[in-house]
């Protein structure tokens, strides 16, 4: 007999054709012989069965000796063996129907679990292959588990179950709730406004929590909560503002922050929480902020920088349109009886560019 | 076992509406169909129509412009609700449960009826 | 819709003798036909399913026959009991129909 596998909710097609393309009479059957629909004349007729709103045949093909049944919106429990009957000759065609979910909400964070359960008939032995949006390939049987969702696996994931040689896909859409950057780092010049910007990986029609940016300045010696605030429906509303700094906020999203002036006491890094309503546990995003200065003090011309810097990152002083007079893997570097004319102060990483400052240095006469 | 009790509507007036329930105990609701049949004074039976555990519906075409059928799994019970009733409608009103097996389809377990009197 | 009749309307029997009930559909409705029992003021019982199919716990002097339109309900040996009203039913095709009944009297 036919093996066909259907998706629950979906709609199957379960085929019947006669020898002789003309109408003639057919039943389909259920396999304890109770009547499904069948042709009474020119009509329709439908059995007690339970599928007797959810079964239908192509009436327009009847003439041409396809007698299908279809059946719509289907649930596992409609896993049976059909019969068709047509011609004296009876066609036996077993539908076996799988359905596969999420067995929390398909919005989730960051680092927790997902887990796909596979419904399927009494009896049947079927295997699951899952493809991540990121190309990750899992397999299992009635359940299949990711343990850490990363925020590369959002979007569909395309799962295939197997029986008796036969597969059918389903796509299920995962949004993991998390930053665009797990980190970022803003390089700016002593005075500079700072823009601190957290870009979230996806979009909700209602996007509803509180958040709060603690900062860990390299100069202090504890953390400190640096402004805490409330998202509703996607609108931002301050709750408490530190008075140095005194950060603002931009009301819609992305989520905005502005730092009036780059200081050295600034310098560190912070921890954007966002909590959102109905979800357990919390979005992270790490921002650092690298403060550079240059002064001239005396006969010593000095380029700092604070922050949390990598040991990779080289810190050059050099006067314009000249090579690099001095440079370190330091977060300090200085000149002594500097040249006069506009120096360069240069934080970069394997060539490129990150920050620069400009001072000039006047001749001492 | 499995029993059936129809609530009592008594008297009902013309073009009201009539509203009838059916508890189920010393079972599940779950998994079967569930009929509605009536039965004038006398006269012999009509089936009404039948509703499923999980609401799916099939009515009577001479009816089904004044019947609706609703299922409550959490209490075990399932009702029928006729619209405007003219005195044609007075009968004894019976649920019962249709059950489905190898060639087998039949109401295996009646309620006791309840007699519904539409009259102003 | 399919139509259901039954004959006799009504018929009285005495004890012990062998009564027939017929039933025709107005169309093939197979095997697909119950017959019910009916005793004053209570509600129907299934004895029959299938055409031919005796119910669990009902007495064996009651049997069907019968396949496509034309059936028929015996009692073998009629009891004091059997007094009632019967009724043939099809389910071959929504709306499920009854047959109007036959009262059974004993003479």
């Known amino acids: 007999k036919k093996v066909v596998l259907g998706k629950k909710g979906d709609t199957v097609e379960l085929t019947c054709n006669a020898s002789q393309k003309k109408n003639t009479q057919f039943h389909w059957k259920n396999s304890n012989q109770i009547k499904i629909l069948g042709i009474q004349g020119l009509f329709l007729t439908k059995g007690p069965s339970k599928l007797s709103d959810r079964a239908d045949s192509r009436k327009s093909l009847w003439d041409q000796g396809c007698f299908s049944m279809i059946i719509k919106n289907l649930k596992i429990e409609d896993s049976d063996t059909y019969i068709c009957e047509v011609e004296n000759k009876k066609e036996e065609v077993e539908l076996l129907v799988f359905g596969l979910t999420a067995n929390s909400d398909t919005h989730l964070l960051e680092g927790q679990s997902l887990t796909l359960t596979l419904e399927s008939p009494p009896g049947s032995s079927p295997s699951v292959k899952c493809r991540s949006p990121g190309g990750k390939n899992i397999q299992g049987g009635r359940t299949i588990s990711v343990p850490q969702l990363e925020r590369q696996d959002s979007g569909t994931w395309t799962c295939t179950v197997s029986q008796d040689q036969k597969t059918v896909e389903f796509k299920i859409d995962i949004v993991v709730l998390a930053f665009q950057k797990a980190s970022s780092t803003v390089y700016k010049k002593e005075g500079e406004q700072v823009e601190f910007s957290f870009p979230l990986a996806f979009t909700l029609e209602k996007l509803t929590g509180s958040g709060e940016l603690w900062w860990q300045a390299e100069r202090a010696s504890s953390s400190k909560s640096w402004i805490t605030f409330d998202l509703k429906n996607k609108e931002v509303s301050v709750k408490r503002v530190t008075q140095d700094p005194k950060l603002q906020m931009g009301k819609k999203l992305p989520l905005h922050l502005t730092l009036p002036q780059a200081l050295p006491q600034y310098a560190g890094s912070g921890n954007l929480t966002l909590a959102l309503e109905a979800k357990t546990g919390k979005l992270h995003q790490e921002v650092n902020l690298v403060v550079m200065r240059a002064t001239q003090f005396q006969e010593n011309l000095t380029c700092e920088v604070w922050g949390p810097t990598s040991p990779k990152l080289t810190l050059s002083l050099k006067l314009e349109n000249k090579g690099a007079t001095v440079s370190k893997q330091a977060k300090a570097v200085w000149v002594l009886n500097p040249e006069a004319g506009m120096w360069q102060c240069l934080l970069s990483d394997s060539g490129q560019v990150l920050l620069e400052s400009n001072i000039k240095v006047v001749p001492t006469w | 076992q499995v029993q059936l009790q129809e609530s009592d509507p008594g008297l009902v007036k013309p073009s009201e509406t009539l509203s009838l329930t059916c508890t189920v105990s010393?079972?599940?609701?779950?998994?079967?169909?569930w009929s509605w049949i009536r039965q004038p004074a006398g006269k012999g039976l009509e089936w009404i129509g039948r509703?499923?555990?999980?609401?799916?519906?099939n009515y009577n075409p001479s009816l089904k412009s004044r019947v609706t059928m609703s299922v409550d799994t959490s209490k075990n019970q399932f009702s029928l609700k006729l619209s405007s009733v003219t005195a044609a409608d007075t009968a004894v009103y019976y649920c019962?449960?249709?059950?489905?097996?190898?060639?087998?389809?039949?109401?295996?377990?009646w309620g006791q009826g309840t007699t519904v009197t539409v009259s102003s | 819709d399919i139509q259901m009749t039954q004959s006799p309307s009504s018929l009285s029997a005495s004890v012990g003798d062998r009564v027939t009930i017929t039933c025709q559909a107005s169309?093939?409705?197979?095997?697909?036909l119950n017959w019910y029992q009916q005793k004053p003021g209570k509600a129907p019982n299934l004895l029959i399913y299938?055409?031919?199919n005796l119910e669990t716990g009902v007495p064996s002097r009651f049997s069907g026959s019968g396949s496509g339109t034309d059936f028929t309900f015996t009692i073998s040996s009629l009891q004091p009991e059997d007094i009632a009203a019967y009724y043939c039913?099809?389910?071959?095709?929504?709306?499920?129909?009854f047959g109007q009944g036959t009262r059974l009297e004993i003479k």
């Open positions: 019962a449960r249709d059950r489905e097996g190898y060639y087998y389809y039949g109401m295996d377990v």
């Open positions: 010393g079972g599940s609701i779950s998994s079967y169909y």
């Open positions: 509703i499923y555990a999980s609401g799916s519906t």
């Open positions: 169309q093939d409705i197979s095997k697909y």
């Open positions: 299938a055409a031919s």
């Open positions: 039913q099809q389910y071959d095709s929504l709306p499920i129909t």
